[in-house]
């Protein structure tokens, strides 16, 4: 009966991971966080990423490594799977570079199973890595910044701050 | 640039309250968690307290949970903390910092600090 | 809580010294170490973070090492500007945790 205590699932309390296809996880994660707390300050901090939108798969990703999927029937959390791993980090790999951080040793990606079948257990993500992103992320680098008001071309979106600034001399009243 | 400065520090007696203002620029704010540090005269650096981007979610240290309240305005691009039942161990300099690291919490930009000191 | 204990304490040192700081966590805390330099009267400043990544803009002379419970700060060569107090802090589990500091000093 030991074991069954074990396996129990518990739910996800961490608010950007919840409704991501399962609920339940169990702790510790895939990265060695025994509460889900600390798990949830450690997503916080992907933040920037997340609404920069370099990849549909990055936060299914993500919980499913601070919140690997648990399920009942067996014992050990269902992470996700080193091709979705591999996805997400070709296509945010170099923003995290824009941001002046490097890529996690804690995702690195060989840490996870090539893909779901009967040896190795884990998720494959959620649909295809090609389709457009939902046009709600924020503003790429090179698009106008509209969102400024009327002299919209004064100003440049900066990867590194995730906003838009001023252009060189405009600030200066150089230009106006 | 990232600018974070502090302001609302000051004399306060024992039980008294007090709010510090963190006001932020140069960076989108909504992105980032912010916390609070602490570093009493002549002493170490003690993490006081953080929130996520959005709001949703705050931390704290066990030595101000229940008398300390962190919160953040969004539209105002501005961090508090809501000091109450403020103690002498409370003394401190304290410093509003974007927590950052993807993956790692650190802090990447630190403000200048404004002191507190409770005294009678 | 994780506690964090720096050693030495304080440390006397010229110029062009290679200078060494330790950090060890009262558990394992995989690579969630981080170093910061402060100055009097100024604010911490992050130098190293994941243990070993150096900050960007941090000259390369600063580096880190470490897993686990132990984890080591070198200064490869110390210049005058590195004269300072140097913190580590552990990210692994709140509440976050600094080390006590070590104050570099010039013999």
């Known amino acids: 009966f030991g074991d069954e205590e074990e396996r129990r699932c518990d739910p996800i309390r961490i608010s950007m991971c919840q409704n991501l296809g399962y609920n339940v996880t169990k702790m510790p994660n895939l990265v060695g966080h025994e509460l889900q707390t600390d798990a949830e300050l450690q997503l916080t901090t992907f933040t920037p990423l997340i609404q920069y939108g370099c990849s549909s798969q990055l936060q299914f990703f993500l919980c499913s490594v601070y919140v690997p999927m648990c399920t009942e029937k067996i014992n050990i959390p269902i992470g996700p799977c080193g091709g979705m791993c591999l996805s997400v980090k070709r296509r945010c790999e170099p923003v995290l570079k824009e941001f002046g951080f490097a890529w996690p040793e804690s995702l690195n990606c060989s840490k996870f199973p090539p893909q779901n079948d009967h040896n190795h257990m884990c998720m494959e993500g959620p649909g295809d890595e090609e389709v457009p992103l939902p046009h709600k992320t924020p503003i790429q680098p090179g698009e106008e910044c509209h969102s400024v008001g009327t002299n919209s071309d004064q100003y440049i979106w900066v990867k590194r701050s995730l906003n838009c600034v001023l252009k060189c001399g405009y600030d200066a009243g150089l230009y106006s | 640039e990232v600018q974070l400065v502090e302001s609302g520090g000051g004399l306060v007696q024992p039980g008294g309250s007090l709010r510090l203002s963190c006001a932020a620029s140069?960076?989108?704010?909504?992105?980032?968690?912010m916390s609070w540090v602490r570093q009493a005269p002549g002493k170490g650096l003690e993490w006081v307290s953080a929130i996520s981007g959005s709001g949703g979610s705050t931390y704290y240290a066990e030595s101000v949970k229940g008398r300390f309240t962190i919160s953040r305005d969004n539209s105002k691009n501005t961090l508090y903390l809501q000091m109450n039942s403020l103690r002498a161990e409370d003394t401190a300099v304290y410093y509003c910092?974007?927590?950052?690291?993807?993956?790692?919490?650190?802090?990447?930009?630190w403000g200048q600090g404004t002191l507190v000191t409770v005294s009678s | 809580d994780i506690q964090m204990t720096q050693s030495p304490s304080s440390l006397s040192a010229s110029v062009g010294d290679r200078v060494t700081i330790t950090c060890r966590a009262s558990q394992s805390i995989s690579s969630y170490l981080n170093w910061y330099q402060q100055k009097p009267g100024k604010a911490p400043k992050l130098l190293i973070y994941?243990?070993?990544s150096l900050q960007s803009g941090v000259p390369s002379r600063f580096s880190g090492s470490g897993s686990g419970t132990d984890f080591t700060l070198t200064i490869s060569s110390l210049q005058p500007e590195d004269f300072a107090t140097y913190y580590c802090?552990?990210?692994?589990?709140?509440?976050?945790?600094f080390g006590g500091g070590t104050k570099v000093e010039i013999k």
């Open positions: 910092a974007r927590a950052t690291g993807f993956g790692t919490v650190v802090f990447d930009y």
């Open positions: 994941a243990a070993s």
């Open positions: 802090q552990q990210s692994y589990s709140t509440p976050l945790t």
């Open positions: 140069g960076f989108t704010f909504t992105s980032y968690a």
